[in-house]
């Protein structure tokens, strides 16, 4: 099992759309594949794929998940908010017929505020 994730770096504007792709390849056929997307180490969703279909279509806030045979798992964030910024990792495991797992490399998502002054104020504001 191998997992290739892309892009490595994604910079989008707040309110637009971000697409993260995970390519999951296995040399032999599989009956059930467990997939997982994490953001900054926290699980966003953990559905499985069987009979060509995802068990879940949503993945985290404003996240939509899709599977395109033979190997493409797509996470679409729409609309993107500032809170979506972070490090995303795709993980996959063949559950049936036998356990094998792999994960992709990090996709770093940077979200630019619609109002550039928001970014300046956010960086400049310190607690206390």
């Amino acid at each position: 099992l191998s997992v290739q994730q892309g892009p490595n770096l994604l910079q989008v504007r707040q309110g637009s759309q971000a697409t993260l792709v995970c390519q999951v390849d296995q040399a032999t056929a599989w009956e059930r594949l467990r997939v997982k997307w994490t953001k900054d180490g926290a699980i966003l969703c953990q559905p499985y794929i069987t009979n060509g279909s995802l068990s879940l279509g949503v993945c985290g806030p404003q996240g939509r998940l899709s599977w395109q045979a033979p190997s493409h798992l797509t996470l679409q964030l729409d609309p993107v908010s500032l809170n979506h910024s972070g490090a995303y990792v795709c993980w996959a495991a063949v559950e049936i017929p036998e356990l094998e797992e792999a994960e992709g490399n990090i996709t770093r998502l940077f979200v630019d505020p619609d109002d550039p002054t928001q970014n300046r104020n956010r960086i400049a504001s310190f607690p206390g």
Partner: antibody, heavy 120, light 113 residues
């Protein structure tokens, strides 16, 4: 361009262990997503898959040979090996090493094969 | 184990004529998850190692002449050569990659009449 070359003794005595090595050139054996396999062909017969090892070290063997087979990888030498224990005359065959990618479920590169005879 | 059955075992063909080889598997090689048939075809020319011709039942491998074509799905597959040439002689094998153990058909020996 990936090339595979089998090497090892052409004659093995019954009950001994057959040891073959496949040297990979033009490609790193530790590349993610690739499997390294052994396949044999008895004289005048068809092809029999022995097993393969993947980039993570996971091994998959033909159940008919599993108790006697070990496939391992030496990344420092860019080689992978086959050991088949307790051989008999029925193990006399041409042994091929081959490779495939997770992305594509087929053997796209093969070695030229090495003939191994089991005889006393 | 999945059993692969090829027919015919021997195939004498006149150059320029078409040829067809059948391969049947004891269970379906189609996966709805990947929308693929895990069936490959190889040609082993005399004294050589096998060479990939067709993968996923119908996709020609790089460098393979377009006179070779693969078709079928599930359990029934066919390799066709539209016009046989002298260089096509050898043994043709079908092979499944659906699960381990991987198994091959017994082979079809194509010879020139």
């Amino acid at each position: 361009q990936v090339q595979l070359q089998e090497s090892g003794p052409g004659l093995v005595k019954p009950s001994q262990t057959l040891s073959l090595t496949c040297t990979v050139s033009g490609f790193s054996i530790s590349t993610s997503g690739y499997y390294w396999s052994w396949i044999r062909q008895h004289p005048g017969k068809g092809l029999e898959w022995i097993g393969y090892i993947n980039y993570g070290g996971g091994t998959y063997y033909n159940p008919s040979l599993k108790s006697r087979v070990t496939i391992s990888v030496d990344t420092s030498k860019n080689q992978f090996s086959l050991k088949l224990s307790s051989v008999t005359a029925a193990d006399t065959a041409v042994y091929y090493c081959a490779t495939m990618a997770d992305r594509f479920a087929f053997f796209d590169v093969w070695g030229q094969g090495t003939m191994v005879t089991v005889s006393s | 184990d999945i059993v692969m059955t090829q027919s015919p075992l021997s195939l004498p063909v006149t150059p320029g004529e078409p040829a067809s080889i059948s391969c049947r598997s004891s269970q379906s090689l189609f996966s709805s998850n990947t929308n693929r048939n895990y069936l490959n075809w190889y040609l082993q020319k005399p004294g050589q190692s096998p060479k990939l011709l067709i993968y996923h039942a119908s996709t020609r491998a790089s460098g393979v002449p377009d006179r070779f074509s693969g078709s079928g799905s599930g359990t029934d597959f066919t390799l066709k050569i539209s016009r046989v040439e002298a260089e096509d002689v050898g043994v043709y094998y079908c092979q499944h990659h659906y699960e381990t153990p991987l198994t091959f058909g017994d082979g079809t020996k194509l010879e020139i009449k």
